[in-house]
Interface confidence: low
């Protein structure tokens, strides 16, 4: 009769997290007479991960009732399976002995490889507001896959970008990976209502990629342009001047007017008119009694927006 | 007959997201007839929020039936509110007028303020390992929390951490905000089991904060320390010398074997101990055929860890 | 401009098998996922499955799964489906579209072929 | 899988009358909607993307509204050529599923 031989059919063997692994083994003999165990790994460090004499392994199921007479049908189950799982397992003939049983044979192995799906990509811009012309970086990450393959792309209002630079970590093998990506954006006066988009595709994706979205109004700063001018007024002794806030973003504005440079009004813009590209205008009018006024008199609308240094326009109003 | 006043009994009313909101209004009149409106701000940019007299508000419920005769209260509901219905909302009455009805009065305001949970804490480690006794560095992001007032917190294995950099985005109002923190761990050899906590306590989380986790061992390198000995050996032509891979981190190790620099073997850890610490020990031999040497021969073990430059041991095997 | 120019008609009998052609034009071919969609003779759509020319990776319709199969060629710009153990009811226009590898949503189903008739009869 | 249900099946209207379709998904789709028009014996052709988004050269006329689960497809005032049948599809969620379709005849 021939020597057994311990028959692990498959190579490998790849199931998603969450899902059972079959691990398929079967003997050509029925002796000698001695228990089988499954182990990971091999050698000294191997982990037991199932024994049929013994113990108690709760996420193992046999496929087949091992104490059935004549069976040779040593197959497993591994239920719930995490990317911790993943490693090469061999299943192992015991020859019954005195005291311990001595190892006999043992398979060739399966790999079992774990699919685990990417996270939700979180994006993050940056911690400063940047003016249009300047570049902003931001960010992309994803944890968790498994294999490390994976595309990684960047858009803005579904244009695809190519400056950013990617990292896929650990470098080596490990049960699951995480992506990181580094994209810059040049900012123009027109990106309030801008977005960028961090699609990541994975095979445990099954073509419907992940996306996680930032948007460029929480990274820009649109300084707005002044013009001061005066209206037209029915009563002698008043003027009406008006200070017109073009095209700002964000909302935060302080408007201060001053007469020959000394602070005559300050005003917080509240009510604001959007504009279609996201920017907001804002108006300030000033009512001058020419009366109290001997001289032509300079009227400076002084404009501090989102906290930035302040801007200014003049205007010489003459007194006839 | 007294004026008619538009009464807004609250001042403010603060609402989670995701819930209605109530916001109450009450007329001290009949009279004049007309319609009332419900705006977010006020003057030429406000928001039209409800109409009573025409249009669909399929977010707005009215709280009392407003067509019925004597009505004066003319509160309404906004359901599933989001942080952008933050705002002051007026309630209005108009004057029945020809051909448009005429704004006669507005209630003082509302002011709703919107509380938004902040996402899961997303932390990210550094892209590139480190050895024990350098400065990584770890994000920790969350976003989309309102009110602003928000507290972040990093421990190491449950000890807090002190060297960290906090910034909540952006600097002036808005409807959410963000949170970006960046530690600074000191790494330790025995730190692959450690784990760094990011925890953010906010008014929503009613006293259960968010964590998010890293784990230390994506971003530690420990180097193998080597150590070669001769084994005894009962066959007297053979010599076996052991070379001792101790406590390193994370797997990925090439050993090779030179005899007087010339190379006698190369081998791939597999089957590695792990040690209490989470650091890996390997060993490997060389046996040495001394019949086929006539001097003295220098054995080095040379060992390449990670991707990084190889350390190498080296032991003088005398041929007596 | 994109265009999709499928294979012509095909008349076949019950049992056998039969290949459709889609070659692409105009755009980067495997920037897209190539999906297939079935229209019986008077009948609505149904959607067969896609493939990803960058790496053959597949998804299908569990009503399709040994039915189709998706292949392609890169270097020719064309995806194939072979359809087999053909039977009366697969008698249909098959017409394949394409969405674009990433989900934005102006590039999903904007090109289609002309159609290819399949009439399976002995 | 997402079923989509559209209704109605046919109906019959004039040149210049207002036409309603609409569609229901049987779980949330966000705004991943197609509306796609198929004349005899051609291909279909896409009107609408993400719901409302009107594809280019495509008249006014069409437009898209709806998310979540219901959806609706709307010609302001219908004209000679938009006699056809009009179909829903999902792209939220594989399998990709059409609605039964609405054949928009003359009255």
């Known amino acids: 009769e021939d020597e057994l031989q311990v028959i692990q059919p498959e190579k490998s063997v790849s199931v998603a997290a969450g899902e059972s692994a079959t691990l398929r083994c079967a003997m050509t003999s029925l002796i000698p007479v001695g228990p089988i165990m499954w182990f990971r790994g091999a050698g000294a460090g191997r982990e037991l991960i199932y024994n049929q004499k013994e113990g108690h392994f709760p996420r193992v199921t046999t496929v087949s009732e091992l104490t059935k007479r004549n069976n040779l049908d040593f197959s497993i189950s591994i239920s719930n399976i995490t990317p911790a799982d993943a490693g090469t397992y061999y299943c192992v003939k015991f020859r019954k002995g005195s005291p311990d049983d001595v190892e006999f044979k043992s398979g060739a192995g399966t790999e079992l490889s774990v699919r685990a799906k990417p996270s939700a990509p979180v994006v993050s811009g940056p911690a400063v507001r940047a003016t249009p012309e300047h570049t902003v970086s931001f960010t992309c990450e994803s944890h968790g896959f498994s294999p490390r393959d994976i595309t990684l792309k960047w858009f803005k209002n579904g244009n695809e970008l190519s400056d950013f630079q990617t990292n896929v970590d650990p470098a080596g093998d490990s049960v699951s990976y995480s992506i990181h990506s580094t994209a810059r954006v040049v900012l123009t006066r027109g990106d309030v209502h801008s977005q960028v988009i961090c699609e990541i595709a994975h095979i445990t994706l099954q073509g419907d990629p992940l996306r996680g979205t930032a948007n460029l109004s929480e990274a820009i700063r649109v300084p707005p342009t002044l013009e001061v001018t005066q209206q037209p007024m029915r009563a002698e002794n008043q003027a009406n001047v008006t200070c017109q806030v073009s095209n700002f973003y964000p909302r935060g504005l302080q408007l201060t007017w001053l007469e020959n440079g000394n602070v005559s009004r300050t005003e917080t813009a509240s009510t604001l008119i959007e504009n279609k590209d996201g920017t907001y205008n804002w108006m300030s009018w000033l009512l001058v009694n020419t009366c109290a006024h001997r001289d032509d008199v300079v009227l400076t609308c002084q404009v501090e927006h989102d906290g930035q240094q302040a801007v200014s326009k003049s205007y010489a109003l003459e007194i006839s | 007959e007294d004026e008619l006043q538009v009464i807004q009994p609250e001042k403010s009313v603060s609402v989670a997201a995701g819930e209605s909101a109530t916001l109450r209004c009450a007329m001290t009149s009949l009279i004049p007839v007309g319609p009332i409106m419900w705006f977010r701000g006020a003057g030429a940019g406000r928001e039209l929020i409800y109409n009573q007299k025409e249009g669909h508000f399929p977010r707005v419920t009215t709280v009392s039936e407003l067509t019925k005769r004597n009505n004066l209260d003319f509160s309404i509901s906004i359901s599933n509110i989001t942080p952008a219905d933050a705002g002051t909302y007026y309630c209005v009455k108009f004057r029945k007028g020809s051909p448009d009805d005429v704004e006669f009065k507005s209630g003082a305001g509302t002011e709703l303020s919107v509380r938004a949970k902040p996402s899961a804490p997303v932390v990210s480690g550094p892209a590139v390992r480190a050895t024990p006794e350098h400065t990584v560095s770890f994000t920790c992001e969350s976003h989309g929390f309102s009110p602003r007032d928000i507290t972040l917190k990093w421990f190491k294995n449950g000890n807090e951490l002190s060297d960290f950099q906090t910034n909540v985005d952006p600097a002036g109002d808005s409807v959410s905000y963000s949170i970006h923190s960046t530690a600074r761990v000191v790494l330790t050899r025995g730190d692959v089991h450690s784990q760094v906590i990011c925890e953010i306590a906010h008014i929503t989380l009613q006293g259960d904060p968010l964590r998010g986790t890293a784990n230390l061992s994506e971003a530690i390198r420990v180097p193998p320390t080597l150590e070669v000995t001769q084994q005894p050996m009962r066959a007297e032509n053979q010599a076996n010398v052991t070379c001792q891979v101790s406590n390193f981190y994370p797997r990925g190790l090439q050993l090779t074997w030179l005899e007087n620099g010339n190379v006698s073997r190369t081998e791939t850890a597999s089957t590695l101990i792990e040690n209490k610490d989470g650091t890996y020990n390997w060993m490997s031999w060389l046996l040495v055929n001394t019949c086929a040497h006539r001097d003295d021969v220098v054995l080095t073990c040379q060992v390449e860890h990670d991707g990084q430059q190889a350390v190498s041991k080296s032991y003088a095997l005398e041929i007596s | 401009e994109v265009q999709l120019v499928q294979s012509g008609a095909e008349v076949v009998k019950p049992g056998a098998s039969v290949k459709l052609s889609c070659k692409a034009s105009g755009s980067t071919f495997t920037s897209y996922w190539m999906h297939w969609v079935k229209q019986a003779p008077g009948q609505g759509l149904e959607w067969i499955g896609a493939i990803y020319p960058v790496n053959s990776d597949t998804t299908y319709n569990q009503k399709f799964k040994g039915k189709a199969t998706l292949t392609v060629d890169k270097s020719a710009s064309t995806a194939y489906m072979e359809l087999s153990s053909l039977r009366s009811e697969d008698t249909a226009v098959y017409y394949c579209?394409?969405?674009?590898?990433?989900?934005?949503?102006?590039?999903?189903?904007?090109?289609w072929g002309q159609g290819t008739l399949v009439t399976v009869s002995s | 899988d997402i079923q989509m249900t559209q209704s109605p099946s046919s109906l019959s209207a004039s040149v210049g009358d207002r036409v309603t379709i609409t569609c229901r998904a049987s779980q949330d789709i966000g705004s991943r909607l197609n509306w796609l028009q198929q004349k005899p014996g051609k291909a279909p052709k896409r009107l609408i993307y993400a719901t409302s988004s009107l594809d280019s050269g495509v008249p006014s006329r069409f437009s898209g509204s709806g998310s979540g689960t219901e959806f609706t497809l709307t010609i302001s005032s219908l004209q000679p050529e938009d006699f056809a049948t009009y179909y829903c599809l999902q792209y939220a969620s594989s399998p990709f599923t059409f609605g039964g379709g609405t054949k928009v005849e003359i009255k």
């Open positions: 579209t394409r969405s674009f590898y990433y989900s934005l949503d102006a590039a999903w189903f904007v090109y």
